[in-house]
């Protein structure tokens, strides 16, 4: 995250780092009590390594009474999600088994009507991404809160020059942004999961290349049978 | 697949108005902006301006701004040039063009003539 | 206001030639962002322009590999590598890094 600050510790009990060997790669969100929701590019170099999934963290790697790891049942990447594009970068995560729910673990509501957000709302977005454009990570969470931009502005020549399907969304990026690491992490938009972070290796903090999250009411349908 | 269709277009006496229409199709209307290009026979492109059908934001060509005035009916996919004081020199194809990607779709363009 | 000048105006050439169209600007359209929005449109008689290059190099889906774009900073090149019958047409360098957006004056390239 850039140009943000640390998170209130425990304050975003649906947050998760999903893990490749034991190191963050990138984050999640909790929609169930087994399955989390990230971002499909985030596993396609993970080949042979261990993917687990941390919950109930804010220090990934303090000890913290509510922190948990979780073995990885099933890894469900969307069927149309491709290495060389952006569309369709979802993936769902089924956990060894239920996770222990409490204040500092819970799912997150996630947005079900297939309607834009309004351009300039402020959504949260939060992760263990780096947070300069020297590449240092960050050990506790971090967050911002960055307006909606509308899908016109974000197809503009000079900013995603039509990329931008119905299925994503857009968030301004003037210093203030996700990055590298926040990918598959979530956009809360009051109190509701309305986008996931996006994996592409997209310059962070330029105000003409805007955050892209994936909108996963367009993704209702396929996460329902996924979870089914 | 994307469409403009461009009308409007025809013979306008000089000082007098026209409102030319572009009616998109094939894709999500309010996802790209809308630019208009003018051509005048046997000369090169020209931008008039631009607008975005979200926030109904203009931006035009200094040589445009108080004459020409861009609208929208997003119910309607479609996107207005408004021409006001319509001088001899107007007299040209009309094209309205997505950006996005680039000006990849254009459509077919509509002739203004302005003569008395 | 950025002006782009294309040169020649008009060209004879023959199929199969190699043809070469260059585009200077009066000054950089190195956008803020690091890119640069210099793209080529192909014109046919009464017909839209066709997007060809995008961002300097860059051939749109759908364009031979015969087209092919160049170029840094003020001055930009387009190429046809062995010219067909389909494309004696007018091509036009573009600008679109900084508003007002801009065309080149034409280049027509006509038969021998």
């Known amino acids: 995250i850039l140009g943000g600050r640390e998170a209130e510790a425990h304050a975003r009990p649906y947050m998760a780092s999903v893990q490749l060997n034991g190191a963050h790669l990138c984050g999640g969100v909790l929609v169930a009590e087994q399955w989390v929701l990230s971002a499909a590019h985030c596993l396609e170099d993970a080949a042979d390594g261990k993917v687990q999934v941390l919950l109930g963290a804010h220090s990934l790697s303090q000890p913290e009474p509510s922190k948990r790891l979780y073995d990885v049942l099933r890894a469900v990447p969307h069927p149309d999600s491709q290495p060389d594009t952006i569309d369709h970068d979802l993936l769902l995560l089924q956990l060894s088994e239920k996770a222990t729910l409490g204040p500092a673990v819970r799912p997150l509501p996630w947005q079900r009507v297939d309607r834009d957000v309004a351009p300039g709302t402020l959504c949260d977005v939060a992760g263990w991404g780096i947070v300069n454009h020297a590449g240092r990570r960050p050990d506790s969470l971090q967050h911002v809160l960055l307006p909606v931009l509308d899908r016109a502005t974000c197809n503009r020549r000079t900013h995603h020059d039509g990329a931008i399907t119905e299925r994503l969304m857009c968030a301004e990026s003037n210093r203030r942004d996700s990055c590298k690491g926040d990918s598959g992490g979530p956009l809360v938009c009051g109190g509701v999961l309305e986008g996931v972070v996006t994996s592409g290796s997209r310059v962070c903090g330029n105000r003409k290349k805007p955050g892209i999250y994936t909108r996963v009411a367009s993704y209702a349908a396929w996460i329902d049978s996924v979870l089914a | 697949e994307v469409q403009l269709v461009e009308s409007g277009g025809g013979l306008v006496q000089p000082g007098g108005s026209l409102r030319l229409s572009c009616a998109a199709s094939?894709?999500?209307?309010?996802?790209?902006?809308m630019n208009w290009v003018r051509q005048a026979p046997g000369k090169g492109l020209e931008w008039i301006g631009d607008i975005n059908p979200v926030t109904g934001d203009t931006d035009y060509n200094a040589d445009f701004k108080r004459r020409f005035t861009f609208s929208l009916d997003t119910s309607k996919s479609t996107a207005y040039l408004q021409m006001n004081s319509l001088r001899a020199e107007d007299t040209a194809v009309y094209y309205c063009?997505?950006?996005?990607?680039?000006?990849?779709?254009w459509g077919q363009g509509t002739l203004v003539t302005v003569s008395s | 206001d950025i002006q782009l000048t294309q040169s020649p105006s008009s060209l004879s050439a023959s199929v199969g030639d190699r043809v070469t169209i260059t585009c200077r600007s009066s000054?950089?359209?190195?956008?803020?962002?690091?890119?640069?929005?210099l793209e080529w449109y192909q014109q046919k008689p009464g017909k839209a322009p066709n997007l060809l290059i995008y961002?300097?190099?860059n051939r749109f889906s759908g364009v031979p590999s015969r087209f092919s774009g160049s170029g840094s900073g003020t001055d930009f090149t387009l190429t046809i590598s062995s010219l067909q019958p389909e494309d004696f047409a007018t091509y036009y360098c573009f600008q679109g890094s900084h508003v007002p957006v801009t065309f080149g004056q034409g280049t027509k390239v006509e038969i021998k």
């Open positions: 961002k300097v190099s």
């Open positions: 000054q950089t359209i190195v956008h803020s962002n690091g890119d640069t929005y």
């Open positions: 094939g894709y999500h209307f309010t996802s790209y902006y």
């Open positions: 063009t997505r950006e996005g990607p680039s000006f990849a779709y």
